[in-house]
């Protein structure tokens, strides 16, 4: 299962950590995809490492752990964020976070 804070808030110009937690007795995480609505933010592969989408490379920092640190937030960053955990064996698990960026 995926456990996450469903709603988080942060100040404009500040930063926020996007974090999902996956727990399973049998499946191992092999990849985690992070998306802002339908737009790819970053991917973490246990074997291949991190890929951060070029459009976000100046504002998205991998970590901590399998999460992301989203920096220099703007009001336009308000919205839904999704983590997708790919596991082996087991399948796909999704989590949702709503980020509200507030005026500073």
């Amino acid at each position: 299962t995926i456990d996450t804070k469903r709603n988080i808030s942060a100040e404009e110009g500040g930063s926020v950590i996007l974090q999902c937690h996956f727990s399973s007795d049998t499946a191992e995480v092999t990849q985690v995809d992070w998306k802002q609505q339908d737009q790819l933010l970053a991917i973490y592969s246990v074997d291949l490492g991190w890929h951060v989408a070029s459009v976000f490379s100046d504002r998205v920092v991998p970590g901590p752990s399998l999460g992301l640190t989203f920096q220099s937030l703007t009001m336009n960053d308000t919205g839904e964020y999704f983590c997708t955990y790919h596991t082996y064996p087991g399948g796909i698990y999704k989590g949702r976070i709503f980020l509200k960026v507030q005026e500073s």
Epitope: D47, L48, G49
Partner: antibody
Framework: QVQLQESGPGLVKPSETLSLTCTVS??????????LAWIRQPPGKGLEWIGS???????YYNPSLESRVTISVDTSKNQFSLKLSSVTAADTAVYYC?????????????????WGQGTMVTVSS | EIVMTQSPATLSVSPGERATLSCRAS??????LAWYQQKPGQAPRLLIY???TRATGIPARFSGSGSGTEFTLTISSLQSEDFAVYYC?????????FGGGTKVEIK
Amino acid sequence: QVQLQESGPGLVKPSETLSLTCTVSGGSISSGSYYLAWIRQPPGKGLEWIGSIFRSGSTYYNPSLESRVTISVDTSKNQFSLKLSSVTAADTAVYYCAIEGANFKDFGYVAFDIWGQGTMVTVSS
Amino acid sequence: EIVMTQSPATLSVSPGERATLSCRASQSVSSNLAWYQQKPGQAPRLLIYGASTRATGIPARFSGSGSGTEFTLTISSLQSEDFAVYYCQQSPPWPRTFGGGTKVEIK
């Protein structure tokens, strides 16, 4: 540019073990950030993924073949290999080695970017 | 595992015409889909990754679209060298799975 070449016997007897090797040239497995994969194609049929291995030794297998498959890597020889035990006529196929995820860091996708030419293996007594 | 289904099995098209190939996943794969072209006696070649991005050296007449469970490969104007078998494939998750293929033949 990385290139792949499969090698091994073209004929294997039923119940024996099929053994194939893929030699990687133009790049070092030990420093490469990609998966090394085996895929097969029975005559006149489609593609079937057999399994993949990362340089660290992490392996992932097709569940339908898992009990019979072993994939290993020899970084010193820049090779990886496939062993498929207890073969039957249904294992007759062209066997391809491939590299998967070579462009992950740059482009964020995992696909079979580079393929060997393939080697035909017939299972028959 | 995710089952990939391609249709049609065979597509008869005249040179210069448009070809539209379909691929359906049994569950959502987001945009984690690749297309390959295979000619007789040759290894497959990567055409499209990420559902819509052309691989290096692939002509602009090849385009991919779709996300989730429904995907399409379009060849805008078929050339003689395009008559081949086309496969879709999802990745990730494990296990990697291919569709059964669509053969594009000369009408």
